[in-house]
Amino acid sequence: YDFTNCDFEKIKAAYLSTISKDLITYMSGTKSTEFNNTVSCSNRPHCLTEIQSLTFNPTAGCASLAKEMFAMKTKAALAIWCPGYSETQINATQAMKKRRAAKVTTNKCLEQVSQLQGLWRRFNRPLLKQQ
């Protein structure tokens, strides 16, 4: 999916008002310096591509993020403010219902969500030069 035509300001507002708080809640009890940011993005569409991938694609050691509140809200924001995104999710939703992974917070998941926090912060500062 190409995130170029999303309403970035509305997605940013949703992140600032609610998604960011859910990410913090998920990471509660973890030191902010515990994980190094290894995933980066260069512009808003690229950031959303990376955010989608890390949020919804199961990875080794962390298969369950899609059921978390921040993930549900991310999915809603993309469906509402990214043209045509919802139709790409019709079959994905069915597949996710079949998988039904239990919600388990592993160290790998905490690391992944730490990466997500970095991607979202970068999404919110699109004019900063990439380090």
């Epitope: 309403d7 949703a14 549900m72 509402i80 043209p83 045509g84 939703t93």
Partner: antibody, heavy 120, light 107 residues
Framework: EEKLQQSGDDLVRPGAAVKMSCKAS????????MHWVKQRPGQGLEWIGT????????DYNQNFKGRATLTADKSSNTAYMELSRLTSEDSAVYYC?????????????WGQGASVTVSS | DIVLTQSPATLSVTPGESVSLSCRAS??????VHWFQQKSNESPRLLIK???QSISGIPSRFSGSGSGTDFTLNINRVESEDFSVYYC?????????FGTGTKLELK
């Protein structure tokens, strides 16, 4: 069974405001956005806007921005639309309709409609 | 905003005939089109979602096709209860818009 129950019909004066409700039952309220649609007598359907309880935010058709205010009370599973500065052009039937925001993505259940008549 | 134009505005048929209703979008919208039926003094009812996906409880005589800018609602052998107004709707991007409507009437 999913149901959307709208408040009753209203007769209001030009320049006044009207607030209508849409009570949802039979499903998880925050899994769906609540959309509002206007239909003037003998005319087609016009999308007014949507309130997304999951994100606690709304979005509007530019034609209604500044006059329509969409809100919801999650504790009672009720969505509201307030329309201000009414004119005769606002005489219409108003529908609420739910639409999944993490699945489904279609207006699959509608309220029965609430008629608003603007007249002096 | 995406404009949806439906044709014809009115279609006169006899029960048992099969009909096709057209919906044309002002720009490509992939398959993000849904079809609704609205009977007099009733709320709209979802018939078809995402251009061609059937809806539980809707008779199989209703089917949809199309993608991009051209979409079609087919009614195979119209029954007396089908005489009403049909609207297409796009949810590709905000603001969501509805088609102008096609009235199916008894010839």
């Amino acid at each position: 069974e999913e149901k959307l129950q709208q408040s009753g019909d209203d007769l209001v004066r030009p320049g006044a405001a009207v607030k209508m409700s849409c009570k949802a039952s039979g499903y998880i309220f925050t899994d769906y956005a609540m959309h509002w649609v206007k239909q003037r007598p003998g005319q087609g359907l016009e999308w007014i806007g949507t309130f997304i309880p999951l994100l606690d935010t709304s979005d509007y058709n530019q034609n209604f921005k500044g006059r329509a205010t969409l809100t919801a009370d999650k504790s009672s599973n009720t969505a509201y639309m307030e329309l201000s500065r009414l004119t005769s052009e606002d005489s219409a039937v108003y529908y609420c309709a739910r639409m999944g925001v993490t699945h489904s993505y279609v207006m699959d259940a509608w309220g029965q409609g609430a008629s608003v008549t603007v007249s002096s | 905003d995406i404009v949806l134009t439906q044709s014809p505005a009115t279609l006169s048929v006899t029960p048992g005939e099969s009909v096709s209703l057209s919906c044309r979008a002002s720009q490509p919208i992939s398959i993000s089109v849904h079809w609704f039926q609205q009977k007099s003094n009733e709320s709209p009812r979802l018939l078809i979602k995402f251009a061609s996906q059937s809806i539980s409880g809707i008779p199989s005589r209703f089917s949809g096709s199309g993608s991009g800018t051209d979409f079609t609602l087919n009614i195979n052998r119209v029954e007396s209860e089908d005489f009403s107004v049909y609207y297409c709707q796009q949810t590709f991007s905000l603001p969501y818009t509805f088609g102008t409507g096609t009235k199916l009437e008894l010839k």
